[in-house]
């Protein structure tokens, strides 16, 4: 089969287009010439905002390591949104 396609059976008389993983899902196993893409749901703490045949789930940004706080929670399709900490003056 051509690049981007895979055999539909052992006989390989026919080929089908690799599928992509939808937003909220990441690639668990990249397709080969004889097998389709295997997708997995992004677990808590990870996200995918694209439809892709290659992209894995990405971890949420760690706001703390940037000395920021979480302004908007992440989902399986979106990253967290970080913002400045509100520092109270003494």
């Amino acid at each position: 089969c051509e690049e981007g396609w895979h055999c539909t059976s052992e006989a390989c008389e026919s080929c089908v287009l690799h599928r992509s993983c939808s937003p909220g899902f990441g690639v668990k196993q990249i397709a080969t010439g004889v097998s389709d893409t295997i997708c997995e749901p992004c677990p808590v703490g990870f996200f995918s905002n694209v439809s892709s045949a290659f992209e894995k789930c990405h971890p949420w940004t760690s706001c703390e390591t940037k000395d920021l706080v979480v302004q908007q929670a992440g989902t399986n399709k979106t990253d967290v949104v970080c913002g400045p900490q509100d520092r109270l003056r003494a």
């Epitope: 051509e2 690049e3 981007g4 539909t8 059976s9 008389e13 089908v16 287009l17 599928r19 389709d36």
Partner: antibody, heavy 115, light 112 residues
Framework: EVQLQQSGPELVKPGASVKMSCKAS????????MHWVKQKPGQGLEWIGY????????NYNERFKGKATLTSDKSSSTAYMELSSLTSEDSAVYYC????????WGQGTLVTVSA | DIVMTQAAPSVPVTPGESVSISCRSS???????????LYWFLQRPGQSPQLLIS???NLASGVPDRFSGSGSGTAFTLRISRVEAEDVGVYYC?????????FGSGTKLEIK
């Protein structure tokens, strides 16, 4: 000679389900996926999805997830499509096709949804 | 989803003349493998669709060489030279590069 013989017309009531068939002959059934295509009266073509009889893998157009269920039976070389919770929007001719980009299509099954 | 646009719902033509049918896609149909997955089908009245042309310009088996296809990227054309009465029907373009596969709305060829 490759042939795809589809089941006859169906008149069904709103809310009901219907299951149509596509019997393949003239080739090794498990070597090709079977696609399904919808055509509403006087309108264009819409890809529903495919079933791979070799491993029962299915791939659906998101628009038809929950509406169409694609299956196959190796022993009879037949692919099936079941449509559920029918409405007037589901009234159409449904085609099966061995390889969407190939030359073998069934003659179509007309589904009419009417009270 | 990739949107396939066939701007002309119908084209009238006199037998023996030539006609062109256009199709545009909302994104490029060029795959990273170098192939462009654009197909043309003809649906004659009361019949199932039949493949005419694959990958822009490759004629399907049994299709007369009066039919030809051209284009690249997002713009494609089906040309029929010396139109015959048997050519009447609706012509559809289809993309096969990305799920879900999508068809144009069709262009009806009518004999004047």
């Amino acid at each position: 000679e490759v042939q795809l013989q589809q089941s006859g017309p169906e008149l069904v009531k709103p809310g009901a389900s219907v299951k149509m068939s596509c019997k393949a002959s003239g080739y090794t059934f498990t070597n090709y996926v079977m696609h399904w295509v919808k055509q509403k009266p006087g309108q264009g073509l819409e890809w529903i999805g495919y079933v791979n009889p070799y491993n029962d893998d299915t791939n659906y157009n998101e628009r038809f997830k929950g509406k169409a269920t694609l299956t196959s039976d190796k022993s009879s070389s037949t692919a099936y499509m079941e449509l559920s919770s029918l409405t007037s929007e589901d009234s159409a001719v449904y085609y099966c096709a061995r390889e969407l980009t190939g030359t073998y299509w069934g003659q179509g099954t007309l589904v009419t949804v009417s009270a | 989803d990739i949107v396939m646009t066939q701007a002309a719902p119908s084209v009238p033509v006199t037998p023996g003349e030539s006609v062109s049918i256009s199709c545009r896609s909302s994104k490029s149909l060029l795959h990273s493998n170098g192939n462009t997955y654009l197909y043309w089908f003809l649906q004659r009245p009361g019949q199932s669709p039949q493949l005419l042309i694959s990958r822009i310009s490759n004629l399907a088996s049994g299709v007369p060489d009066r039919f030809s296809g051209s284009g690249s990227g997002t713009a494609f054309t089906l040309r029929i030279s010396r139109v015959e009465a048997e050519d009447v029907g609706v012509y559809y373009c289809m993309q096969h590069v990305e799920y879900p596969f999508t068809f144009g709305s069709g262009t009806k060829l009518e004999i004047k």
